[in-house]
């Protein structure tokens, strides 16, 4: 047998060399096209396992999009034809609740999750006999990467986990599926930085294949929570990084989500974007915002992919994406996942399993309507899966997809066998579809959520609500005490009420200055290197949020540390959520908060509000009868007509859909 090269096994403490054999009847003369279904026999630790695989048809679309850049920095859009891809999911015969994510591109490579262990398999380098190495994922050496909890805490947590008798995976999955009965779809966009691209030999195909493999692994981990990962796009920074990656993880994350909001969202709709970087941050494996998956401004994370395998890296991305999905760290909580450590353990453990706590955190997100964007089954031009009627994704060429024949019995509008609409139906799904008919134009489909939002209406000829828009960033709100920022009026009292209950309000300015000048975890202007930054007086209103009149103590799945600081006759209340260094602190003042005359908070500094690029003269552009929306179009008051609010009409904008229906005036807002 060929001996594995040192590089291939240097990260393993133990492994076996095996030769899988194929059980399918059809002979495979050439490597492509790949079979839709295939079975193999593989050996692991003296046992033979039969594995059954089917192509993961929900993973990629017909027009899967890849963005790259040429030498001049011009954006290039490519739609590689990879419907017949080689990425599979499946199960181990006779092993209850097993799951597999494998690619069969050049040999077998991927992950097998059995009841009590996870295995990695990959082709043996330079073997001409289809030999592979198989190893327990526990036997992979990993750098001690972290998410900000000290090693002592991690050791203590691990020791506690070993003492407990974990519930079986069966029990866990049964409990989870009862909690999360409805499938959620995460439309994931991956961005690969220049250094990682260089590390892959500047081979775009290799980067693409690796990221599709990664998405398949993620899908195999998230499926236990009834969450599907749909990779909607990939961007490779082939010509140079489009953000500054100098500084700490927090700086890079901030730069990335700002870039995403400005450049990526407009190009390709998605729920979360994850940046893949080669550069490390001194032991921090990644960083992401918590509970922001549907946010225009913060649905993102950064993930360090250095000298580790894609299998190990998958658990880092699963962890950071988990934060976006509302999951906090497991450390210090009563969590179990049927393994020594779980994906949301802060120690980047390489785990494949989500814990009971993660399931509960995600459920909280969905109950609080933080996951509304995950309910839509991706549209044909966005869902990059090889078309397949019955997968509950409306693929190219389909009008609807109600799923299995049994599920389709309950769908009055969709013909299950053809994925076409029934003869009498105009539509089968969507916010503007009811009883198989388009709702009339002027039907409210997305109400105004704050004074900085605008409503959207059905247009009468589509099942979809108009795209979400809001008042342009920088428009004054709260009696000129604040600015609109991403559809919310960002002011201090409201932020205190979110954390400390409806009676709370912002503490006096002296509190902010006094507490935030300290540069500790309760008062700071961010984190740099390994220490908290003290706030200069001019930035104090952009550091840790200070509140008073506190009557409720917050609980967001974890119990935060709360500090009271006496200051000139009042008590200033602040909070440290102790979420770890890979999670931006929700106890800080929000970005976009007005911190002075003509100034807003950005990156914990009080900077000129001109950075918001507000350029709307409502008197000139909207004739004093409307406001500019996030597309820089007028949204007119009731009584005035778009586009410029200068003639009589029924309000709204060119983006909102018609606000009025001639057949039924009662529909008007």
């Amino acid at each position: 047998a060929a001996r594995p090269g040192f590089q291939q096994t240097s990260h393993l403490s133990s492994y076996e060399i095996i030769t899988p054999w194929r059980l399918t009847r059809e002979r495979r003369e050439a490597p492509r096209p790949y079979s839709k279904q295939v079975s193999y026999v593989i050996q692991a630790e003296g046992k033979e396992h039969i594995i059954h695989l089917e192509r993961n048809k929900d993973l990629l679309p017909e027009d899967f999009v890849v963005y790259t850049y040429n030498k001049e920095g011009t954006l290039i859009t490519d739609h590689p034809n990879i419907q017949n891809h080689c990425h599979y999911r499946g199960y181990v015969e006779g092993v209850h609740n097993s799951s597999i994510a494998l690619s069969d591109c050049f040999g077998l490579r991927g992950l097998l999750h059995l009841e009590n262990a996870s295995y990695g398999i990959e082709p043996l380098q330079n073997s001409s006999h289809f030999e592979h190495i198989i190893y327990r994922m526990d036997d992979v050496y990993k750098e001690p990467l972290k998410c900000g909890v000290s090693n002592k805490d991690i050791e203590k947590e691990t020791a506690k986990d070993e003492e407990e008798e974990p519930p079986s995976m069966t029990q866990l999955l049964r409990r989870r599926r009862a909690v999360l009965p409805q499938t959620r779809y995460v439309e994931l966009f991956i961005v690969v930085d220049k250094e990682r691209y260089d590390m892959m030999g500047r081979n775009q195909t290799a980067v693409r294949e690796e990221m599709i493999l990664l998405a398949n692994y993620l899908d195999s981990m998230y499926i236990m929570l009834n969450i599907r990962i749909v990779l909607v796009g990939l961007e490779i920074w082939t010509n140079g990084n489009l953000i500054n990656i100098v500084g700490g993880a927090g700086d890079v994350l901030g730069n990335f989500v700002q870039w995403r909001e400005k450049f990526l969202i407009t190009r390709r709709r998605h729920d979360s974007a994850q940046l893949v970087l080669k550069k490390g941050f001194g032991g921090t494996a990644g960083m992401a915002f918590v509970g922001t998956v549907c946010s225009r401004s913060h649905a993102g994370g950064i993930n360090v992919f250095g000298q580790i395998t894609v299998e190990t890296f998958a658990s880092i991305v699963a962890h950071e994406l988990g934060h976006n999905l509302g999951m906090n760290h497991d450390d210090g909580r009563d969590c179990s996942c049927g393994a020594k450590s779980c994906i949301m353990n802060s120690g980047a453990s390489g785990s494949r399993n989500f814990s009971s706590c993660s399931a509960e955190d995600f459920e909280k997100l969905t109950l609080n309507k933080g996951g509304n964007c995950l309910l839509n089954i991706p549209k044909p031009d966005e869902a990059y899966s090889a078309p397949s009627c019955g997968n509950k994704l409306v693929d190219a060429g389909e009008e609807c997809d109600c799923g299995t024949p049994k599920e389709c019995e309950l769908d009055p509008c969709c013909e299950g066998s053809t994925c076409k609409l029934k003869s009498f139906a105009e539509c089968a799904y969507g916010d503007c579809c009811k009883d198989c008919r388009f709702l009339p134009g002027g039907t409210l489909c997305r109400g105004k959520t704050s004074e900085c939002d605008v409503p959207e209406y059905c247009n009468g000829s589509s099942q979809f609500c108009q795209p979400d828009v809001f008042i342009q960033n920088g428009y004054p709100c709260q009696n000129n005490k604040a600015y609109c920022y991403n559809g919310m009026c960002q002011y201090y009292d409201a932020q205190c009420q979110v954390i400390f209950g409806s009676k709370a309000k912002a503490a006096p300015k002296d509190c902010f200055i006094e507490v935030n000048s300290k540069g500790d975890r309760f008062g700071n202007c961010g984190f740099s290197g390994n220490e908290y930054k003290k706030c200069a007086t001019g930035n104090a209103l952009c550091g840790k949020l200070q509140c008073e009149n506190v009557q409720e103590i917050p609980v967001f799945g974890i119990v935060p540390a709360i500090i009271q600081t006496p200051s000139r006759g009042t008590k200033c209340w602040g909070v440290d959520f102790q979420l770890g260094s890979d999670v931006p602190d929700p106890g800080m003042v929000n970005e976009g908060t007005k911190c002075g005359a003509g100034k807003i908070c950005r990156n914990f500094q009080c900077v000129d509000a001109s950075v918001l690029n507000y350029d709307c003269d409502v008197q000139k552009k909207c004739h004093g009868h409307g406001v500019c929306n996030s597309n820089k179009n007028c949204h007119c008051e009731n009584g005035w007509a778009p586009p410029n609010c200068e003639t009589k009409g029924y309000g709204g904008s060119v983006d909102s859909g018609p606000t009025y229906n001639e057949m039924n005036t009662a529909l008007r807002d």
């Epitope: 005490k481 912002a506 300015k509 002296d510 000139r568 005359a597």
Partner: nanobody, 127 residues
Framework: EVQLVESGGGLVQPGGSLRLSCAAS????????IAWFRQAPGKEREGVSC????????YYADSVKGRFTISRDNAKNMVYLQMQSLKPEDTAVYYC????????????????????WGQGTQVTVSS
């Protein structure tokens, strides 16, 4: 550009009165909290009186309560400090300060957490 200019200071005998004025430009007065501070030689700056932007609530330091009155004329963009029964210990440079009051700055025991400051006007109480 926000500017504050104080006037009305001078030399006055104990028991006398003065009216300090603060002319504001570059912003509308009614959306700002305005305060008067003073600093005597060799001492820390202390708050004398302030008027809140939100509801016009006024506060006074214990040492001036009943003797000083703060008021504002939004139409003229002016703030006044009427000082009566002056004492030698009121001798100091008096400063006018303004803040957009995004969080409270005008309150009992307030500190100098104001964004904009005037140059000051000298008040001397001496016989």
């Amino acid at each position: 550009e926000v500017q504050l200019v104080e006037s009305g200071g001078g030399l006055v005998q104990p028991g006398g009165s003065l009216r300090l004025s603060c002319a504001a430009s570059g912003f509308t007065l009614d959306s700002y909290a305005i305060a008067w501070f003073r600093q005597a030689p060799g001492k820390e700056r202390e708050g004398v009186s302030c008027i809140s932007s939100s509801d016009g609530t006024t506060y006074y330091a214990d040492s001036v309560k009943g003797r000083f009155t703060i008021s504002r004329d939004n139409a003229k963009n002016m703030v006044y400090l009427q000082m009566q029964s002056l004492k030698p210990e009121d001798t100091a440079v008096y400063y006018c300060a303004a803040d957009p009051e995004l969080v409270t700055v005008c309150r009992p025991g307030w500190g100098p957490a104001y964004d904009y400051w005037g140059q000051g006007t000298q008040v001397t109480v001496s016989s």
